[in-house]
Interface confidence: low
């Protein structure tokens, strides 16, 4: 911690400027006060000050707000963010989607630190649920992020959001996230017609279970291998040939290369043999 | 949580066939999710997979022991069972049933339980 | 079936080592790549899972990486309950082998 000490005379910081990068982190301490340093926060980021000066302006807003700081302070910390810690952090109120947005923006390009989950946690848990601006907000900063989140925390995305989320966004989700997200992203794109809704729903088709995709096997809509490799193997044993068939459409070639793994070879154990061979595909039950 | 408990006879004379279960506590054997193993450590070696069984009673074996292992699952009693027929001194090992999920990882294991062939 | 070559086989450490463990596959098996540890009298531990993806609860100074048929386990500073034997998985095709093991000793 740094000194108290009485600040020279003359060096009294009227305003937050450039002059003050050539202050020593005790001048910077003693010299600049609190309440003038929250009230020019947008200010700190055009000047160039050392990781050591920020410390000193950090430790002087921490003595000012010690129950954390104030939404108004928060949205202009600008790179001074990267010096919190998820325990400063936990005591902040953030409300708006403009401040949120703010601090993703000086970690934007990194992957997502222990003080930005805790401010995600923090934002999200204020507005109750997982809205569709912020989620727009968080997959644009961070295409991973729906798939971080537990199938608990996943339950209060409302199906409005699910508009928001794209294909890549679920990349790395799990069945159990899938399961929560799929009954969501049905609702959302039910007044759909066809072709335009089996383009939305595919990337969520992994929580499918058996009579959706039966029903799909019904309209034509050609899913590709990718997309059937990702389906619930509970949910692929009930399909019949003909269903798989017309699910894959002229995609069913594929099945011969992906025989040997799941969940096409738990399929096609469960199928007679005179069926698959209708296949014309040499596939051995 | 899950856990996974091995049982079955610790001793098995030659050419006999050796028979263990696997009890799911904690969760549902039933899971559409998840894949039951049984998976095998000689002492002092490697661990070699021996198959699995889907709850709708599919089951996968691994080619080299595939003439001689049966795995079933009963679902009432949330357990499912390795038979492996003809055994010999090389299928002295400790036995694990384990948990694997749709990425093809064994996330949870029994304890193990050791079994000697000998006569 | 496809192979699961680790190496070395064992090798000696000391705390604070950044230790690095490589499996080779016989064939292409996508990122289809587990690792395991292993204490004795214990059954093995899933660390790794989808070649870099590390499972809930293993701390953060286990990573792997690699795709194809070369794979890496690294711990980047080993610690006294690292010391065990480290496996390698194949869940690509349905033989599910697993490599021979790397033993990672005190040095």
């Known amino acids: 911690e740094v000194e108290k000490t009485a600040c020279p005379s003359g060096k009294k910081a009227r305003e937050i400027d450039e002059s003050l990068i050539f202050y020593k982190k005790w001048e910077l301490e003693a010299c600049v006060d609190a309440a003038l340093l929250a009230t020019q926060m947008d200010r700190v980021n055009a000047i160039p000050f050392t990781y050591e000066q920020l410390d000193v302006l950090k430790h002087k807003l921490d003595e000012l707000y010690p129950q954390g700081y104030p939404e108004s302070v928060i949205q202009h910390l600008g790179y001074l963010f990267l010096k919190m810690s998820p325990e400063d952090i936990r005591k902040w109120n953030v409300t708006s989607l403009e401040t949120l947005k703010a601090l993703l923006e000086v970690n934007k390009g990194h992957e997502m630190s222990p003080q930005v989950a805790t401010l995600i946690d923090r934002f999200v848990k204020g507005r109750g649920q997982l809205d569709k601006d912020t989620l727009d907000t968080l997959t644009a900063f961070y295409p991973g992020y729906l798939c971080s989140l537990s199938p608990e925390e996943l339950s209060s995305v409302p199906p409005s959001s699910i508009w928001a989320v794209r294909p890549q966004d679920l990349d790395t989700c799990d069945p159990r996230q899938l399961d929560v997200l799929y009954p969501k992203a049905r609702l959302a794109f039910q007044n759909m017609n066809g072709s335009e809704y089996f383009v939305k729903i595919q990337s969520f088709l992994g929580g499918a279970p058996t009579e959706d995709l039966k029903a799909l096997s019904q309209q034509n809509v050609s899913m590709d291998l990718a997309t059937f490799m990702k389906l619930r193997t509970d949910a692929v044993l009930p399909l019949t040939v003909a269903e798989v068939q017309k699910l894959l459409g002229p995609h069913v070639e594929g099945l011969k290369a992906e025989e040997r793994h799941r969940p096409v070879r738990d399929w096609i154990l469960r199928q007679r043999q005179d069926d698959l061979d209708t296949l014309g595909l040499g596939l051995q039950g | 949580q899950v856990q996974l408990q091995e049982s079955g006879p610790g001793l098995v004379k030659p050419s006999e066939t050796l028979s263990l279960t696997c009890t799911v506590s904690g969760g549902s054997v039933s899971s559409g999710s998840y894949y039951w193993s049984w998976i095998r450590q000689p002492p002092g070696k490697g661990l070699e997979w021996i198959g699995y069984?889907?709850?709708?009673?599919?089951?996968n074996y691994n080619p080299s022991l595939k003439s001689r292992v049966t795995i079933s699952v009963d679902t009432s009693k949330n357990q499912f069972s390795l038979k492996l027929s003809s055994v010999t001194a090389a299928d002295t090992a400790v036995y694990y049933c384990a948990r694997e999920g749709k990425n093809g990882a064994f996330d949870i294991w029994g304890q193990g339980t050791m079994v000697t062939v000998s006569s | 079936d496809i192979q699961m070559t680790q190496s070395p086989s064992s090798l000696s450490a000391s705390v604070g080592d950044r230790v690095t463990i490589t499996c080779r596959a016989s064939?292409?098996?996508?990122?289809?790549l587990n690792w395991y540890q292993q204490k004795p009298g214990k059954a093995p531990k899933l660390l790794i899972y989808?070649?870099?993806s590390l499972q809930s609860g293993v701390p953060s100074r286990f990573s792997g990486s690699g795709s194809g048929t070369d794979f890496t386990l690294t711990i980047s500073s080993l610690q006294p309950e690292d010391f065990a034997t480290y496996y390698c998985q194949q869940p690509y095709d349905a033989s599910y082998t697993f490599g021979g093991g790397t033993k990672v000793e005190i040095k």
């Open positions: 989808a070649a870099s």
């Open positions: 069984i889907y709850y709708s009673g599919s089951t």
């Open positions: 064939q292409s098996i996508s990122s289809y």
